[in-house]
């Protein structure tokens, strides 16, 4: 909906989780609400309780199975409803036909580690978490490095247009503390968005050798 005061937005992590946020101006704070998922071609259905994340925003995770199980495919459509309790009955507040592989947001990359560090460069690797095998190599990454005296927002974005789970950072300053983050996005899906940023990886470049030109 164009109206930003009221939205029902969900993303699929490509395996066994649909995360939803329901925002609604003027909604009752103490009302019990839930998201109900009803797939068009599966025998299961699932519910999660919406919990407040801000004054007019609620969120919940529909856990569809074991974290790495492939619970939905590109042909699935899941009808999602927001239901709120009104006295003894439940009232539908919002509804959508959710196409999971058009609305992807993967988990943040994990297991960041420094493979090799020198005075001016650092090689870092990571892993993707709970990503569907359907993507094969059709993923892209963005990375950013936090330099001393700067903010994350000021950090230039480095784009990796392929499934490359490592990066070699160059032109770094010797004996300097840095932090590094990476995020991932499938190429598939009209409404697909970037994963959250990974946990920052702190590293320090090696000091320049004494007597050497830096």
């Amino acid at each position: 909906a164009v109206n930003g005061t009221s939205q029902f937005t969900c993303f699929y992590n490509s395996r066994a989780n649909i995360s939803c946020v329901w925002s609604q101006d003027g909604a009752l704070q103490d009302t019990s609400c839930q998201v109900h998922a009803w797939p068009d071609r599966r025998r299961w259905n699932q519910t999660c309780e919406l919990l407040p994340v801000s004054q007019a925003s609620w969120a919940c995770n529909l856990i569809l199975g074991a974290p790495d199980s492939q619970k939905l495919t590109t042909v699935d459509i899941v009808t999602l409803r927001v239901l709120c309790r009104e006295g003894v009955r439940w009232r539908v507040m919002a509804i959508q036909d959710f196409k999971p592989f058009e609305n992807l947001r993967l988990m943040a990359p994990i297991s960041l580690q420094v493979v090799h560090v020198e005075t001016h460069r650092c090689n870092i690797s990571w892993e993707i978490s709970q990503a569907s095998h359907y993507f094969e190599r059709h993923l892209e990454f963005e990375a950013r490095t936090l330099s001393p005296g700067h903010t994350w927002e000021e950090a230039p974005l480095l784009t990796l247009k392929q499934k490359q789970e490592w990066i070699c950072l160059e032109t770094l300053t010797p004996d300097t503390q840095y932090e590094f983050q990476v995020r991932v996005k499938p190429l598939q899906g009209e409404f697909t968005t970037w994963s959250p940023w990974s946990q920052p990886l702190a590293f320090r470049t090696k000091p320049a050798a004494l007597g050497k030109d830096t």
Epitope: A1, V2, N3, T5, S6, Q7, F8, T9, W22, S23, Q24, W38, D40, I77, T79, R81, V82, V92, M93, A94, I95, Q96, D97, K99, F191
Partner: nanobody, 123 residues
Framework: QVQLVESGGGLVQVGDSLRLSCAAS????????MGWFRQAPGKEREFVAV????????VYADSVKGRFTISRDNAKNTVYLDMSSLKPEDTAVYYC????????????????WGKGTLVTVSS
């Protein structure tokens, strides 16, 4: 952009039936929620029914449940509202509306509206 054109309104008697049609066009129709709303003279516009385009899942207002049926024909890009057992209080201008991504968190909030078609139920 979604364009919506309603038709089928008219004057009917209490207890009669009527079918309203809403022809939809535009790039995002295939993923929209389509709804019917109504506005009686001197009253606020109210939600009647909504249908999801892909699966045909429906929601109805309590006041029309069991009497009105919303449906859609994907091939014709048309949404229908079949109204039966009509009452004088069903007299109103009926509007077709569409909600496109990102979807509204409120059944009363839609992105696109038709111009409406008048239904008059006389006793």
């Amino acid at each position: 952009q979604v364009q919506l054109v309603e038709s089928g309104g008219g004057l009917v008697q209490v207890g009669d039936s009527l079918r309203l049609s809403c022809a939809a066009s535009g790039r995002t129709v295939g993923s929209a929620n389509m709804g019917w709303f109504r506005q009686a003279p001197g009253k606020e516009r109210e939600f009647v029914a909504v249908i999801t385009w892909s699966t045909g899942s429906t929601v109805y207002a309590d006041s029309v449940k069991g009497r009105f049926t919303i449906s859609r024909d994907n091939a014709k890009n048309t949404v229908y509202l079949d109204m039966s057992s009509l009452k004088p209080e069903d007299t109103a201008v009926y509007y077709c509306a569409a909600d496109v991504y990102p979807y509204s968190g409120n059944l009363n909030i839609m992105d696109y509206w038709g111009k409406g078609t008048l239904v008059t139920v006389s006793s």
